[in-house]
């Protein structure tokens, strides 16, 4: 969402977001570190492409040509310096001027030693319980967001981990029309079009930067879970990484595992959608995870097999018309799971990104929820290494990501809703080790590949 | 003038506890992250671990995960390490030093005066 | 863990001689790297940080390179107040373990 020293009257009313970076003579003397050339404070540059029709409540939310309902200044920053006030690097980059390469390897969980999955799991356990050192979330609507009395801002503190879930909540949620009317549900800035690879794309990046910064460890990485085995068992839930199931109730995580400690954000939606109000930092009841429960739908109790991602690989066009959820012959449509795995378009399939999901089976399959389950950061590690797989085999050919009537959010020049600084998906679209800083250490199935008897 | 100013000698027996402080001045310690370091007798340095003080948060080299705890008191400007279960190989300096919280600094860039800790059966 | 070999483990030079100490990493550490100088009974003391950045108020004798996993100090025009131990030390990832260090001796 935004920096917390934006989250003041005057930086609401002013419509800038523009923070010092090291002030020696006063505040606003060196916003953007202007004064040692790092950037600039500048206008935004919003999307006003048009959208596709399906959604048509323009002017009734917040995300429209994000971010300007809230800032239309921002830091822009020079060369390789980044952040809200071009104090850090961008990702791939580090030292005093933002000229020395890095590299980082996402590998697999399962390959990692037993102190490296204990430092992981620890890790992300500090996230759930740390406080987020620079953003603060918007408990309102920017047309509240100033409080009853005009003069109190409404943002909240909230944890490294729970922004993380909150964000994607943001991104997902509902447009609100009003007391007592029905809110728009046909919306979603980071699924079901163009945005969703480079969306979970940035939100990984964040996490992982906020957690490298929370650890002081620039080498640390967020592992993957090759979810694409075929079987009917979730391989990373045991109780020394992801969590057993419990014997107590099969639909939560055994009590050995930090992980049935974790209490789920944004779960109130009947208030978020009649009240207008948006999730904040309360914490609930637990994670709900029950693998291959779901008897009812049995096509959900197997996960991907591995020649699906091989298969979901050779499928050349990143996108295609209507570019949302029955498009057929898209990458990207292929990969979240809406078609099969060979891009054929079917409104009763579940592959891929999606079955993994559901797979699940709890909180991990229910979208505005689904980062509670911290699964969901491996799944989606590993679904951003396929992309990163096409990427690299067709040369990132960005072409048939649609510049405009793509449904909203998911232009190639928006940018990605709640993120801070703006940050659009072509900035996304790109190979991650040669533009990113990041690396996944991973062998792809061939097509032929097939599980022996 | 930025000063870490630690805790006198100790001689403990072993299996004992003990706890050192580490009493800052010349800088808020909730903007840097405090970290212990360990140098036997003419041996070289070893990392223990660090602790920000603004949230409480530690990190451990595992080998002395469970017998290293790292606390601190903003009120005071104070972080302590607390050493349990000392065995004969405990025997040694402990030093308090600090780094940015700026993680792209890579450096430990003030120290403190080093506290002894004996253990004698 | 990345594991840092430092080496020579001591060395002996006269004044104004110039000397090199390195230290290995097991792995890339890209730059993260600091170096610090220790007399007999003090507190270690830093020199150079980011692998080549020179602390405030260290002679411009003392000087950091390297990249990758090869890093070193330089001393040159050595003086006698430079004997001591040295460290280097890694902070890319934890543990963020120091080499073994080296004694050097002013004859």
């Known amino acids: 969402q935004f920096p917390r020293q934006c989250a003041t009257v005057e930086a609401l009313r002013s419509g800038m977001c523009c923070p010092d970076l090291s002030p020696v003579s006063g505040p606003g003397t060196d916003r953007c570190g202007s004064s040692s050339g790092r950037g600039r404070c500048e206008a935004v540059t919003a999307d006003s492409r048009p959208h596709s029709p399906q959604y048509p409540h323009d002017g009734r939310d917040d995300r429209e040509v994000w971010p300007l309902r809230f800032f239309n200044r921002t830091c822009h920053c020079n060369g390789n310096f980044s952040g809200h006030n071009c104090g850090t690097c961008r990702p791939g980059w580090r030292g005093a001027a933002c000229d020395q390469r890095v590299l980082i390897v996402r590998r697999n969980l399962l390959d990692l030693s037993k102190e490296e999955k204990n430092h992981f799991v620890r890790a992300l356990d500090m996230a759930k319980r740390t406080t987020h050192p620079l953003f603060v979330i918007a408990t309102r609507r920017s047309e509240e967001i100033l409080g009853p009395d005009g003069n109190t801002p409404q943002f909240e503190n909230i944890s490294i981990y729970n922004y993380f879930v909150w964000t994607h909540y943001y991104s997902v949620k509902k447009t609100f029309l009003g007391v007592g009317q029905e809110s728009f549900g046909e919306v979603d800035f980071s699924h079901e079009g163009p945005a969703f690879l480079t969306w979970h794309r940035y939100h990984l990046l964040r996490l992982e930067k906020d957690m490298q910064e929370m650890l002081q460890e620039p080498s640390f990485s967020l592992p993957y879970w090759n979810f694409a085995t075929g079987k009917n068992v979730c391989d990373i839930c045991t109780d020394d990484l992801m969590g057993s199931r419990s014997n107590f109730d099969s639909t939560l995580i055994s009590p050995n595992s930090v992980f049935s400690q974790w209490r789920v954000v944004c779960d109130s939606l009947e208030d978020y959608d009649t009240l207008g109000t948006l999730c904040n930092s309360t914490e609930d009841g637990p994670i709900r995870r029950n693998p291959a429960g779901n008897v009812a739908r049995p096509m959900v109790q197997r996960l991907p097999e591995p020649q699906d991602v091989a298969q979901c690989l050779e499928v050349g066009l990143f996108d295609t018309p209507p570019f949302y959820s029955n498009s057929t012959n898209s990458f990207r449509n292929t990969v979240e799971g809406y078609s099969d795995p060979t891009g054929k378009y079917d409104p009763a399939v579940r592959s891929l990104h999606n079955l993994a999901h559901l797979f699940l089976n709890g909180t991990g399959g229910q979208t505005h929820l689904s980062p509670n389950d911290p699964i969901f950061v491996l799944l989606h590690t590993f679904t951003d290494a396929v992309f990163d797989e096409w990427l690299r085999r067709y040369n990132a050919d960005i072409s048939t990501f649609p510049l405009e009537n793509a449904p909203i959010g998911h232009n190639r020049q928006y940018n990605m809703v709640p993120f801070w600084p703006p940050v659009t998906n072509t900035e996304m679209f790109v190979t991650a080790p040669d533009n990113l800083g990041y690396t996944y250490e991973i062998q792809w199935p061939s097509r032929e590949f097939s599980v022996p008897e | 003038e930025v000063q870490l100013q630690q805790s006198g000698a100790e001689l403990v027996r072993p299996g004992a506890l003990v706890k050192l402080s580490c009493k800052t001045s010349?800088?808020?310690?909730?903007?840097?992250?405090l970290h212990w370091v360990r140098q036997r007798p003419d041996q070289g340095l070893e990392w223990i671990g660090w602790?920000?003080?603004?949230?409480?948060?530690?990190v451990y080299d595992p080998k002395f995960q469970g017998t290293a705890s790292l606390t601190a008191d903003t009120s005071s400007n104070t972080v302590y390490l607390q050493l349990s279960g000392l065995t004969s190989e405990d025997t040694a300096v402990y030093f308090c030093?600090?780094?940015?919280?700026?993680?792209?600094?890579?450096?430990?860039?003030?120290w403190g005066q080093g506290a002894s800790v004996i253990v004698f059966s | 863990a990345i594991q840092m070999s430092q080496s020579p483990a001591s060395l002996s030079a006269s004044v104004g001689e110039t000397v090199t100490i390195t230290c290995r990493a097991s792995?890339?550490?890209?730059?993260?790297l600091a170096w610090y100088q220790q007399k007999q009974g003090k507190s270690p003391h830093l020199l150079v940080y980011?692998?080549?950045t020179l602390a405030d108020g260290v002679p411009s004798r003392f000087s950091g390179s390297g990249s990758g996993t090869q890093y070193s100090l330089k001393i040159s025009s050595l003086q006698t107040e430079d004997s001591g131990n040295y460290y280097c030390?890694?902070?890319?990832?934890?543990?963020?373990?120091f080499g073994s260090g080296t004694k050097l001796e002013i004859k």
């Open positions: 030093t600090r780094r940015d919280y700026t993680y792209e600094k890579a450096a430990l860039d003030y």
């Open positions: 010349g800088f808020n310690i909730k903007d840097y992250f």
């Open positions: 602790i920000n003080p603004d949230n409480g948060n530690t």
């Open positions: 792995g890339n550490i890209y730059n993260y």
């Open positions: 980011d692998a080549k």
């Open positions: 030390q890694h902070f890319w990832s934890l543990p963020f373990t």
